[in-house]
Interface confidence: low
């Protein structure tokens, strides 16, 4: 009777020196199972069976389309995910046995999410406004209005805002004002105009000239009445207001009618009021 | 099983309004782009609307523009297209159908409601 007791006491001392306090916490990389720790599998392996007494964990490889990518205690590999092209996707990364699939969207689309689970297209920028950023497999394409000095007359997901062309550099003159949706129209230079200009110009001061001396003559005519023997032939002086006599008037409207700048702003303040409709 | 199931369809006098309704199952609604198409009697099938997973972004037909819209309700798996001002050539089965992108034909459709536009 007194025997039991003491064996008692006995296994139990022998129990505590073989097996010491279960742990509560392990080291990193390892589980606790059953009071005691166990190694974690590695990335791109499974769990066969936890680890005993006397057998070490039991892991296995990730199947073929399968992964992990953590120091795990999975029973199952997690399926690689499916880029799926009825949904826009492409795989942009294939999958290994630690890291998953990473799909991206096709050619002129972009994913709708971080997941990037389905695409949608690019958004084009509209006339008037140009692309600030080109889109990418997982933003959108970012627009700007086109400043001024530039246009865009296209709806793209790709064309900046052009600059207006500078007539300057071609040796010619705005002839229409651009907008942010049109270039501005280039036309020939004063100088090249002058060319046309000036011997009309020089035209109408002959035929003045010519009727100036015409009407001197006509003056200088004898008259059939006998004149006063002391009257000397006068010299005539004509008023400022003759035709003729101002020649500035009809040169300035004639260079006015020949200029087709004058026209071109009425024909410029027209299309502006198209585009606003 | 894909199964999508129209409603709302009925007779309607022109320049009223009907609202149609998909209800979606079978798969996972919320990443799928989706789409309404119609055919008239005697007619083939004809492209109505689009709209992305999201909702974001629809695109109609020159026909529709203006007077329908599409949209949906991702948490409901629901599909509508609201159409205003209708007109006698509006008259067509209406089906709604999962899209295949990016080219948005569809490889799945219901079996159509009516919508009939007559005085």
């Known amino acids: 009777m007194v025997r039991l007791p003491l064996q008692c006491v006995l296994w139990g001392c022998l129990l505590t020196a073989v097996h010491p306090e279960p742990p509560t916490a392990c080291r990193e990389k390892q589980y606790l199972i059953n009071s005691q720790c166990c190694s974690l599998c590695q990335p791109g392996q499974k769990l066969v069976s936890d680890c005993t007494e006397f057998t070490e964990t039991e892991c296995l490889p990730c199947g073929e389309s399968e992964f992990l990518d953590t120091w795990n205690r999975e029973t199952h590999c997690h399926q690689h995910k499916y880029c799926d092209p009825n949904l826009g996707l492409r795989v942009q990364q294939k999958g290994t046995s630690e890291t998953d699939t990473i799909c991206t969207c096709e050619e002129g689309w972009h994913c709708t999410s971080e997941a990037c689970e389905s695409c949608v297209l690019h958004r084009s920028c509209s006339p008037g406004f140009g692309v600030k950023q080109i889109a990418t497999g997982v933003s959108d394409t970012i627009c700007e209005p086109c400043p001024v000095g530039f246009f865009s007359n296209v709806s793209s997901a790709f064309e900046k805002c052009h600059p207006w062309t500078s007539c300057e550099t071609k040796d010619l003159v705005v002839q229409q004002a651009g907008t942010n949706k049109t270039d501005v129209v280039c036309g020939p230079q004063d100088r090249l105009r002058a060319l046309v200009v000036i011997p009309i110009i020089f035209g109408i001061l002959f035929a003045i000239l010519l009727v100036l001396v015409f009407i001197k003559k006509v003056a200088k005519k004898p008259t059939n009445k006998a004149p006063h023997p002391k009257q000397e032939p006068q010299e005539i002086n004509f008023p400022d207001d003759l035709p003729g006599s101002n020649t500035a008037a009809p040169v300035q409207e004639t260079l006015h009618g020949c200029q087709p700048v004058t026209q071109e702003d009425g024909k410029e303040s027209r299309i502006s009021v198209q585009e606003r409709q | 099983e894909v199964q999508l199931l129209e409603s709302g369809g009925g007779l309607v006098q022109p320049g009223g309004s009907l609202r149609l309704s998909c209800a979606a199952s079978g798969f996972t609604f919320r990443v799928y782009w989706m789409t309404w198409v119609r055919q008239a009697p005697g007619k083939g099938l004809e492209w109505v609307s689009s709209?992305?997973?999201?909702?974001?972004?629809?695109y109609y037909a020159d026909s529709v523009k203006g007077r329908f819209t599409i949209s949906r309700d991702n948490s409901k798996n629901t599909l509508y297209l609201q159409m205003n001002s209708l007109r006698a050539e509006d008259t067509a089965v209406y089906y709604c159908?999962?899209?295949?992108?990016?080219?948005?034909?569809?490889?799945?459709w219901g079996q159509g409601t009516l919508v009939t536009v007559s005085s």
């Open positions: 709209i992305d997973p999201q909702g974001g972004m629809t």
């Open positions: 159908a999962k899209a295949r992108i990016p080219n948005l034909e569809f490889d799945y």
